[in-house]
Interface confidence: medium
Amino acid sequence: MDSFNYTTPDYGHYDDKDTLDLNTPVDKTSNTLRVPDILALVIFAVVFLVGVLGNALVVWVTAFEAKRTINAIWFLNLAVADFLSCLALPILFTSIVQHHHWPFGGAACSILPSLILLNMYASILLLATISADRFLLVFKPIWCQNFRGAGLAWIACAVAWGLALLLTIPSFLYRVVREEYFPPKVLCGVDYSHDKRRERAVAIVRLVLGFLWPLLTLTICYTFILLRTWSRRATRSTKTLKVVVAVVASFFIFWLPYQVTGIMMSFLEPSSPTFLLLKKLDSLCVSFAYINCCINPIIYVVAGQGFQGRLRKSLPSLLRNVLTEESVVRESKSFTRSTVDTMAQKTQAV
């Protein structure tokens, strides 16, 4: 989002021969921030603290285990995606505090706000990879015994990252800084040069590939997994169901406002009241999506506590327990406890 529109008061300069309205305060930087922006700042601050510390801890725990444990490889990659995105938060925070003024230059404008989209695509693709792994463990245990290894897992992660980078390119390319006079500031946003078709195409691709298609496939995937799990009377199936639902749902819940407002804005005229309202909510939607970057460690800890009864262990050892248990393929096609539990933890970051 963050699309430039050339008729809104926020982006008013002279495209429509605007001049300064002397009845309104000039120096908007002295005005109070809008409520959605204040909420966004609060969310950004919390996400940054929890996301950086939590994901750093997850990286630390899983990095040592990644050589021998496939689950550790999945969680390591998810944590890296989240951690990377969190690094952009201080800059985004500063920009909102300055009423969206962007003093950081064109390169930073292209890269930093694109990190959340890279995170979205990397996370959903990694989640899809993890889900495929879970699916194969349940339905193709013999194949897993023969072929499921760390090398293949790393290749799958590399493919996911590569695709995520490709899918982020449009946002990266269309992101520019633009100078404004009223009020004086430099803005960072997406500029489609009045090409509504192109803007819609990008929004639709993002909605379909980053949300609707994963929602459909993961829902089907986990429906099959859970049905098989229940039919085999696997242990802790209720808890597993709850955690899996929490895991997958968190991605879709936190990305929903961003995706909905993004697709609506691409179809609305920039001068329409609905567009102007959505524009004001833009930062809040981005910050809400950013919650994905800190939710994983929280889910891991909550899940770990659930499986341990209560928090008796240190945080690292609790996380190690949750993230690095290897799935064992048994002759019977029923899930092992470790398989169910680890899947149950968090197979997403998106």
Epitope: H13, Y14, T19, L22, D27, E179, V186
Partner: antibody
Framework: QVQLQQPGAEFVKPGASVKMSCKAS????????ITWLKQRPGQGLEWIGD????????DYNEKLKSRATLTVDTSSTTAYMQLSSLTSEDSAVYYC??????????WGQGTTVTVSS | DIQMTQSPSSLSASLGERVSLTCRAS??????LSWLQQKPDGTIKRLIY???TLESVVPKRFSGSWSGSEYSLTISSLESEDFADYYC?????????FGGGTKLEIK
């Protein structure tokens, strides 16, 4: 570093037109407004107009609007100002500037236009 | 058009002296005012924008202030390179308009 380069001088006959250039380098040309100013010998500064290269959006001083045309060539990162129907009143130094609503502004050295038969 | 009345039109001062130039706007322009310096060789430099904000490369001896419709540029301690022409410029509405200029000369 950011630079705006203007040719030193242009000599034209009355009634003719002149197209002066302002070559920008060292920054994202399409992101910043280019402003044009005029200064007649021994006199003060006068604003001619400005252009946003990312869009070609222009604003003019009504005094010169009918005779001044601001354009850009984004491929060569150059802004142009064309003045038509020149008279001796148009003999002046013309400056281009990346005004910069925040942070630094950058200025060309000016092009001296002499209108003489 | 907004008229900008700049005073004085010329000023003689000594090195190390403190000087102030003023500009009055005929209409409200809030903080949309800049101060420009033009050296004898014609080169122009913006010193102040948004009435009070100093450009990053400009020495701290320059400062801008405003009260109502009156705007001031103050040089706390004159140095030899400060002797030049100074213009105020409003950019609150079209067309942008300049003050008549102040010629600052060595006494």
């Amino acid at each position: 570093q950011v630079q705006l380069q203007q040719p030193g001088a242009e000599f034209v006959k009355p009634g003719a037109s002149v197209k002066m250039s302002c070559k920008a380098s060292g920054y994202s040309f399409t992101s910043y407004w280019i402003t044009w100013l005029k200064q007649r010998p021994g006199q003060g500064l006068e604003w001619i107009g400005d252009i946003y290269p990312g869009r070609g959006t222009t604003d003019y001083n009504e005094k010169l609007k009918s005779r001044a045309t601001l354009t850009v060539d984004t491929s060569s990162t150059t802004a142009y100002m064309q003045l038509s129907s020149l008279t001796s009143e148009d003999s002046a130094v013309y400056y281009c500037a990346r005004w910069g609503t925040t942070g630094r502004s950058y200025w060309g050295q000016g092009t001296t236009v002499t209108v003489s038969s | 058009d907004i008229q900008m009345t700049q005073s004085p039109s010329s000023l003689s001062a000594s090195l190390g002296e403190r000087v102030s130039l003023t500009c009055r706007a005929s209409q409200e322009i809030k903080t949309y005012l800049s101060w420009l310096q033009q050296k004898p060789d014609g080169t122009i430099k913006r010193l102040i924008y948004a009435a009070t904000t100093l450009e990053s490369v400009v020495p701290k001896r320059f400062s801008g202030s405003w009260s109502g419709s009156e705007y001031s540029l103050t040089i706390s301690s004159l140095e030899s390179e400060d002797f030049a022409d100074y213009y105020c410029l409003q950019y609150a509405s079209y067309p942008w308009t300049f003050g008549g200029g102040t010629k600052l000369e060595i006494k």
